[in-house]
């Protein structure tokens, strides 16, 4: 039962992890304008991974994308491609898991088969998880330096007379959903890989052999014996599960953005 | 159509309070916020303040201790309040709706507030 | 507060002739995010509430004719105003949309001869 159960949770918290992990590559809040010890602007800026955002106190907003893919940072390009090499991984992720699921029957799939792809769907949810947390680093560390970097020349004065005001970013919400979500997709991964230990199947560590008494036939199995004294670790009988009634409908919703271009 | 009307209580008596009523048409005030502008006789145009669609306002700097501005969105209206008035707060008060870039992109014909004993 | 100086003060030309009027910021008005000047011009007749004829800079007004042009960045701005008709006698104020407080200029009166 509790192996089902972690196997379910790690499914469950992988998958909110990784629609997390979607939410938070496609969110224009990955760097925002810092409000803080700047002159009041009517007008605020903010960036996501494809395109770059003006909402004016007016309440219009105009978004612009990265139309060109030389001309952009390599930074930007590393954290994007990280985090859709942990969507990508996470999805296959998914729907490995999906038939792995000790309550989901499939045809006459054996348990050995189920742990393997268990495994390799926890494996895949930890990379996932781990490449979105790079990700989202790269990009934070992106700004703190450039942070400070237009920090120290704030103002660029010309002849001491006309003054031009930087703008500074700082950290958006997609990049602490990004990091919460990575953290669950990586938890997921780890509840994954505990599930598989307990799903590989117990193999019997003594062949059962005939052993026979002169003037008897009586045939001893030193499997029962094995058992009674508690040897070894995988020996304990394991109850087979049904899985029961218990379907759940996961839904997931993804923020919908309205942009007034 | 976009329309915008002030209505004022024409005389003050300086230290008195002013209130300015802007009613407005052919709008909502859920989407656009609304500016006010005052000109003294023969002089320029001085902003005064504003509030935006979601609430939030910004005042001019020199009147912030004796301004406010708030709105009634159901009845469509945005209200300007004034207080401690002086004789040199007499000017034409209009109001403006805050389109694209921030500008003021449709005007009232305003209403002349004159602060006089 | 940012100060908005517009220059000249007054301009008299005739009908027909191609007029440009000034208008400096104490700071840039030019946001880096969508590189868009927030620079208005507004043209104010007697005894009329003002109207908006240029925003972004160089962006006109719905109804505005194409003989009014607005150009500049940062700083510097300008309202060119290409053939004067009788109906151009106004007075002519640049407003900053970028930084709070608003302000205005305090407008170039052009008159005709």
């Known amino acids: 039962m509790a192996v089902t159960a972690c196997q379910g949770l790690g499914f469950v918290v992988s998958l909110i992890g990784i629609a997390g992990i979607i939410a938070a590559t496609c969110m224009d809040q990955w760097s925002t304008q810092d409000l803080y010890n700047n002159p009041v602007t009517a007008v605020f800026n903010y960036q996501g991974l494809w395109r770059s955002c003006v909402r004016e106190s007016s309440g219009f907003t105009e978004c612009r994308g990265y139309f060109t893919l030389l001309g952009l940072p390599a930074m930007l390009q590393a954290v994007r491609a990280l985090m859709i090499v942990g969507i990508v991984l996470g999805a296959i992720g998914l729907l490995v898991s999906i038939f792995a699921l000790k309550c989901i029957r499939i045809g006459s799939m054996e348990d050995s088969a189920k742990a393997n792809m268990t495994l390799t769907s926890g494996i895949m949810f930890i990379v996932s998880g781990l490449c979105a947390i790079a990700g989202v680093s790269v990009f934070a560390n992106m700004l703190v330096t450039n942070f400070w970097m237009s920090t120290a020349n704030m103002y660029t004065g010309m002849g001491g007379m006309v003054q031009t005001v930087q703008t500074r970013y700082t950290f958006g919400a997609a990049l602490f959903v990004g990091w919460v979500a990575g953290g669950l997709t990586l938890i997921g991964g780890v509840m994954m890989c505990i599930a598989c230990r307990g799903l590989a199947p117990e193999e019997t560590n003594y062949k059962a052999v005939s052993y026979h008494a002169s003037g008897h036939s009586v045939a001893y199995k030193p499997g029962g014996f094995k058992a009674s004294t508690g040897f070894g670790s995988n020996t304990k009988n394991k109850k087979i599960y049904d899985g029961g009634a218990r379907t759940e409908d996961e839904v997931q919703s993804y923020p919908s953005k309205h942009d007034y271009v | 159509q976009v329309q915008l009307k002030e209505s004022g209580p024409g005389l003050v008596a300086p230290s008195q309070t002013l209130s300015i009523t802007c009613t407005v048409s052919?709008?909502?005030?859920?989407?656009?916020?609304v500016q006010w502008v005052r000109q003294p006789p023969g002089k320029g145009l001085e902003w005064l303040g504003v509030?935006?669609?979601?609430?939030?306002?910004n005042y001019n700097s020199a009147l912030l201790s004796r301004l406010s501005i708030s709105k009634d969105t159901s009845k469509s209206q945005v209200f300007l309040k004034m207080n401690s008035l002086k004789t040199d707060d007499t000017a034409m008060y209009y109001c403006?709706?805050?389109?694209?870039?921030?500008?003021?992109?449709?005007w009232g014909q305003g209403t002349l507030v004159t602060v006089s004993a | 507060d940012i100060v908005m100086t517009q220059s000249p003060s007054s301009l008299t030309v005739t009908a027909g002739e191609k007029v440009t009027m000034n208008c400096k910021s104490s700071?840039?008005?030019?946001?880096?995010?969508?590189?868009?000047?927030?620079l208005a011009w507004y043209r104010q007749k007697p005894g009329q509430p003002p109207k908006l004829l240029i925003y972004?800079?160089?962006t006109r007004g719905s109804g505005v004719p194409d003989r009014f042009t607005g150009s500049g960045s940062g700083t510097d701005f300008a309202l060119t105003i290409s053939s004067v008709q009788a109906e151009d006698l106004a007075v002519y104020y640049c407003?900053?949309?970028?930084?709070?407080?608003?302000?205005f200029g305090a407008g170039t009166k052009l008159d005709l001869k």
């Open positions: 972004w800079a160089s």
């Open positions: 700071q840039s008005l030019l946001n880096s995010g969508n590189q868009k000047n927030y």
């Open positions: 403006a709706r805050g389109g694209y870039g921030n500008s003021c992109d449709y």
């Open positions: 509030i935006w669609a979601g609430g939030n306002t």
């Open positions: 052919g709008f909502s005030l859920t989407n656009y916020g």
């Open positions: 407003q900053n949309d970028y930084f709070y407080p608003l302000t």
